[in-house]
Interface confidence: medium
């Protein structure tokens, strides 16, 4: 239960986390299980311990083995085991199964491929991506933070994806690669004319001048993968970005949820420091998909302060 498999390639950086978790203040001791020899914490060593992390900078085939970590607190000790295997680099393009991280599935709507284990490393952009050993090129592929986004996913996009990045440790750079398979799901569903759940048509929302206010535009579109479905806000018939009022911002990205099996999207409009002039604006929640566009209009009204006098 408290044993974890980790693997890497020779001459690349490998960082392993102790399978037993503890507070950052707890001390963690690492040992090489075969010899019971303590792993040093001095960073000048090629293999050293750094709290919950065991670092191989870079890794060598001879580093393979079981490592023991002991998380020590004032009241208890917890022991975990890291089973580390370092492999020789392959001369050909094939990535063997034992070097593959978990398979991820994608669809037209969601095609993110996360770079495995990257959160353990001190890396900086750019993150490079390869499919079946070929560097990915073209506008359909976007390396975004620690994941790859593929636009207009097709069945041909299935395959083995490798991310490559540089880990920096005290000014020294080490290469890291990680590979995982990506499969494409063909989701059968149906779509409907958008149904806006909130706000109600011609809703009046009470707000307090000087306070912050949130408006949520929420709509459902059908079942399964929804093609070109979207929700957004407009101000006086203009895109939020074009309206030019920095206090009024649309939340980045659309949150997807499922209500009674239906695919729904919502978008939050945030108004900071509500002003009198905001009450004069027309706020339109737009929901659209391949069947059309539906628009619900909201206006703001001043919330009357509660009268505490009898």
């Amino acid at each position: 239960k408290f044993s974890k498999q980790s693997w890497g390639l020779e001459n690349e950086a490998l960082i392993v986390r102790c399978p037993r978790q503890g507070k950052p203040s707890y001390t963690v001791d690492w040992y090489y299980s075969q010899t019971n020899k303590s792993i040093p914490t001095q960073e000048r060593n090629r293999v050293f311990a750094s709290g919950q992390l065991l670092k191989f900078l870079p890794a060598a085939v001879a580093d393979s083995g079981i490592y023991t970590c002991i998380v020590r607190s004032p009241t208890f000790n917890r022991t975990g085991y890291a089973n580390v295997t370092i492999y020789k680099k392959q001369s050909d393009c094939n990535v063997p199964d034992y070097l593959m991280y978990s398979t991820v599935s994608g669809s037209e709507k969601n095609s993110k491929i996360y770079c495995p284990t990257i959160d353990l490393y001190n890396w900086t952009a750019p993150l490079e991506w390869f499919k079946n050993c070929q560097a990915l090129q073209g506008s359909r592929y976007r390396a975004h933070k620690s994941f790859l986004v593929i636009d207009n996913v097709m069945t041909e996009d299935a395959g083995d994806y490798t991310c490559k990045f540089i880990h920096n440790e005290n000014g020294a750079n080490y290469s890291v690669t990680a590979t995982r398979s990506f499969t494409v799901k063909d989701e059968q569903g149906f779509s409907l004319f958008p149904v806006i759940g909130a706000p109600a048509q011609n809703e009046i929302k009470e707000v307090e001048i000087g306070k912050n206010a949130n408006l949520t535009c929420s709509a459902c579109f059908g079942k399964g993968t929804q093609f070109l479905a979207a929700v957004l806000w407009q101000l006086n018939g203009t895109k939020i970005t074009d309206f030019g009022e920095p206090r009024i911002q649309q939340e980045e990205g659309q949150n997807q949820s499922f209500s009674n099996g239906l695919a729904c999207l919502d978008m939050v409009l945030r108004i900071a420091d509500v002003k009198e002039e905001d009450l004069l604006l027309q706020y339109d929640c737009l929901a659209l998909n391949l069947h059309g566009l539906r628009r619900h209009t909201v206006r703001l009204s001043r919330k009357n302060p509660i009268d505490h006098h009898s």
């Epitope: 037209e108 149906f190 779509s191 093609f227 070109l228 979207a230 957004l232 895109k239 737009l286 659209l288 391949l290 069947h291 059309g292 566009l293």
Partner: antibody, heavy 116, light 107 residues
């Protein structure tokens, strides 16, 4: 009245690109999808792709994936369809069409001839 | 993708007669079906959407029916201007697909 006016006929060499424009008037350009459909001589209609100007998002038929790019300029209410790596079988009339799922208004069509 | 199949490929009808055109989908498209008319050298024109709703300005002699996988376009009394090619199109799921067309010619 609502209308879509397309750019004029083009003659192109194989391997080159063509960019067809479609200027919309008489309706709120950003409120509707703009589709592109082509028709080879004596053949039926073939859907190529669609753009939603309000989102700036486009979607393409798998057959044209990687070769077609559909864009929109809100300021001029104009949609564009660019097709690259042209081959002789791309010789066709290219139509823009406004609508959601059904296309209620069509452009007059742009004849693109690909010939060496 | 959903394949749309129209029949017959050609329909020969005399003016004033009734014409019935069929369209079949390879899987259910609910009522998300449109019919278009195209005359030589012209762009297509929308006749019917939602399987049975006439588009703006379309004469009452054009009617659409059906749902799921079987659809029919009926022209109750053919006028000279109705001789053209007719296409059905589904917009139930991506990608949008058209039938191969039915040519209505003068008998």
């Amino acid at each position: 009245q609502v209308q879509l006016v397309q750019s004029g006929a083009e003659v192109k060499k194989p391997g080159s690109s063509v960019k067809v424009s479609c200027k919309a008037s008489g309706y709120t350009f950003t409120d509707y999808y703009m589709h592109w459909v082509r028709q080879a001589p004596g053949q039926g209609l073939e859907w190529m792709g669609v753009i939603i100007p309000v989102l700036g998002a486009a979607k393409y038929a798998q057959k044209f994936q990687g070769r077609v790019t559909i864009t929109a300029d809100e300021s001029t209410s104009t949609a564009y369809m660019e097709l690259s790596s042209l081959r002789s079988e791309d010789t066709a009339v290219y139509y823009c069409a406004k609508g959601w799922g059904a296309f209620d208004i069509w452009g007059q069509g742009t004849m693109v001839t690909v010939s060496s | 993708e959903i394949v749309m199949t129209q029949s017959p490929a050609t329909l020969s009808v005399s003016p004033g007669e009734r014409a019935t055109l069929s369209c079949r989908a390879s899987q259910s498209v609910s009522s998300y079906l449109a019919w278009y008319q195209q005359k030589p050298g012209q762009a297509p024109r929308l006749l019917i959407y939602g399987a049975s709703t006439r588009a703006s300005g379309i004469p009452a002699r054009f009617s659409g029916s059906g749902s799921g996988t079987e659809f029919t376009l009926t022209i109750s009394s053919l006028q000279s201007e109705d001789f053209a090619v007719y296409y059905c199109q589904q917009y139930y799921s991506y990608p949008w697909t058209f039938g191969q067309g039915t040519k209505v010619e003068i008998k």
